[in-house]
Each structure stands twice: as C-alpha cells, then as structure tokens.
Interface confidence: medium
Amino acid sequence: DCCSCQEKWVGYRCNCYFISSEQKTWNESRHLCASQKSSLLQLQNTDELDFMSSSQQFYWIGLSYSEEHTAWLWENGSALSQYLFPSFETFNTKNCIAYNPNGNALDESCEDKNRYICKQQLI
Amino acid sequence: ARHCGHCPEEWITYSNSCYYIGKERRTWEESLLACTSKNSSLLSIDNEEEMKFLSIISPSSWIGVFRNSSHHPWVTMNGLAFKHEIKDSDNAELNCAVLQVNRLKSAQCGSSIIYHCKHKL
C-alpha cells in the first residue's frame, strides 16, 4: 500500500530511506538509488534524519554544484537553501557533499567512497 | 511532519516492525517501563541483519535481555534463554545487555543508556 516501504528500507514520516552499509563513489551511489526507483537523499531540513542523529557515519547525498547555475543543486534541480548548511560557501565546488545525520556536512572528492542514503517519498 | 503508515507517529518502520528510537537515557528498568508505557517492548534483536541495521541507526542502546546474577543464564523478556554471545559476561556486576556497535555487551543495569522500543506489526 502507499504507506509501505520495500524490504530493507526504513519508513519515517511518509518517506522511505535506504541506508547503505556499502561504500560507493558519489556517481555509483546516484545510479544505485536510481536503479531502486529513488534518488540520493534530498534534505528538507536538518532534522529529517533525527531518528539516526547518533550515527557516526557520513553519507553521500544528492547535492552537486552546477557550473551553469553557479549554485549547489539537488538532483531534482532545486537550489540548496542557505539555511541548511551555513558552511556551504566554503565547499569546494569540484567536490560532492557527504552528510552526517546530526546536521554536519562536508565536501569530499566525488571519487571517494562513502555510504549513501536513497530516498523515496510515499505520498 | 506528515504521518503515514502502521506505526505510531515519529516511530520508524523496518522489516515489519516499528521502532521508537529514543534519545533520552534511562536505567535498564526505567527503559523497560518506558517501552511498556508505549505499548511496546524494550528492543529485542532477532537476527544479525537487524543488529547491523540498528547499529547504523544508533551506536548503543539497551536490549531486552538480562540475568538475575552471573550464575544465571541470560534470558529475554519472555523468559527464553538468550543464545547469542554477550561480551564481558564474566563480570558479576554487569547483568543487563546492551547493543554496542554490532555486538552485544553486558552493562550495569543502573547505568543511564539510550533505549529503543520495538513492536512487531
């Protein structure tokens, strides 16, 4: 039904999340999410993942820099809110963004391997 | 925040169970009562895969496993013997069990540790 997530996915506040335990490059992560009919995590706010705010891990999220728009964009083309990561102005625009669920973000080479989070909206 | 599904609001669903992921610390007994008041049980771990998942979500929490003393066996809340290895079991003061980064350990029941609750759908 509309309120069920697929097996091995976490359901929270009408969203489904796949939290990987494997480490992949940013591009590999993006393709893996797409193959599951989802996309790399797009955050609405920094408490979206507060159910795992004690996690020690950083995860690739669906944020990349667009030279064309000179802005950090989510996979759906929307722009990053300046309030989400106050330090985003210091991010290296050649890098990809890894996120820790207690609100920290860092920029790392997109070829580095990290865990990743895919997200599906239920409704 | 929108609410959807079969679990209480602000709980998570995973593999046909609902989980309350606590942020507050309690003793083992207080945690037991807190989960009971939420119509659920102190976290039980059914398999290795579930343990890995929970370790990703939260590095440590009480689980519903205890013993009366170091001379007694580890048991679950429904009185069944708990078969999985619990580290540091030789310490007579540590009679309640904790999930800690992919392994189970014994701890002092009066310690304040984060707790999670679970109920199966």
Epitope: S54, Q56, Q57, G103 | I113
Partner: antibody, heavy 119, light 106 residues
Amino acid sequence: QVQLVESGGGVVQPGRSLRLSCAASGFTFSDYAMHWVRQTPGRGLEWLTFISYDGSNKYHADSVKGRFTISRDNSKNTLFLQMNSLRAEDTAVYYCARDSWDRGYFDLWGRGTLVTVSS
Amino acid sequence: EIVLTQSPATLSLSPGERATLSCRASQSVSSYLAWYQQKPGQAPRLLIYDASNRATGIPARFSGSGSGTDFTLTISSLEPEDFAVYYCQQRSNWWTFGQGTKVEIK
C-alpha cells in the same frame, strides 16, 4: 587499569613530520571510536581528528586536513597520529581521547605528549 | 563552527561556597554539551554529558543544566580539590570547546 598513554612527542623543525602513538589498556579498544585533541595556552583545547571503532570513518578539523592523518591498529590496541608539514602553530600538548559509547564526548584521556615545532 | 563562550574567565571563591559557571553557544546545540575539569599538569576529566548527566564517579555536588544556547555548571559546595579549570564542549556540530573558566581560591 583503564588508561591511554601517548608517546612520540618531541622537538621537530617546521616542515618535518612526526608520528604520535597512543597505547590503550584495560578496556576493549576495538569497541570505541577515538579522537586526538591538542591544547595550547593561547588557543585552549582544540579537537583535531576522529576515527570510528573499526577505522572505516575518519574526520579531520580544517586546521589539520591534508597534513594530519589518524589511524589505528586494533590488534595492537594502538591509535596513531601522523603529522606532516608541521608548523610553529602546531606546537601543543597532544592528547588521545576515547569517545563515549554513543558518540561525541571524551570519557577517557591520556596524559598528553608535548610537540614543539621550532627551528 | 559553533563557538562556545565561557564566563567568567576567573571565579574566586572559598571552600564551601557555591560556584556557578556559564557556557553560551553561538547557535543551538540542543542538549549536546559536556563539562570537563582540568587540573595543572593533568588531562581533562569528563564531569557532565548531555548537559545534565553526571559521568561515572562524579560527586553529586556537580550538576549541569540548560539547553539550546545557554548552559550552567554548578558546584553546590566547593571542596579543596575542585579548584581547577573547567571547560564546556559541544558535539552538536563537530567538536568544539569553550576557552575555560578558572575556579581559584579566594
């Protein structure tokens, strides 16, 4: 007893390297994430770097990123800090510290080792 | 980064008196704040974590309170061994420390 003991400090010239070690005893080292923290009279306590219990996650402060690397050998109960391209401002007492179970607080510290960067 | 500002820099009190130390964060850290005690020549020692929980073996005269941006460490009745430097530390966003408050004998 439960303790952490740092070693490897000393006087080193700017631009050179140094490797600090931290020997853990009295607890199951492989269960705990670890940190390095340094202290100077001018800047106080400064967190430097973190490593998860199994070594799979490492984070570094901007002030040392690209120069300092944290690592661990769980079979030897030892934490390391490789410090390259040292600068005068790296002069400090360096502490290793154990991370509390559920992350973020330093519940056990070593006595510290002094690193002096001077020509 | 989150900046923690401690006040006062120095607190001069006599044994038996009550000590109140303040720590203010530049942005909310929820309750993710700890207090440490450091004596000369020694490493810091964890006193309080998550704003108000006493660490193992810490006497009841030490208590912590606060959430968000304003936190307090209270020592209800100073013992001779309590004269030291006290630091606050947050873990809400990476890890940062306050500059310390020295509690000295009056």
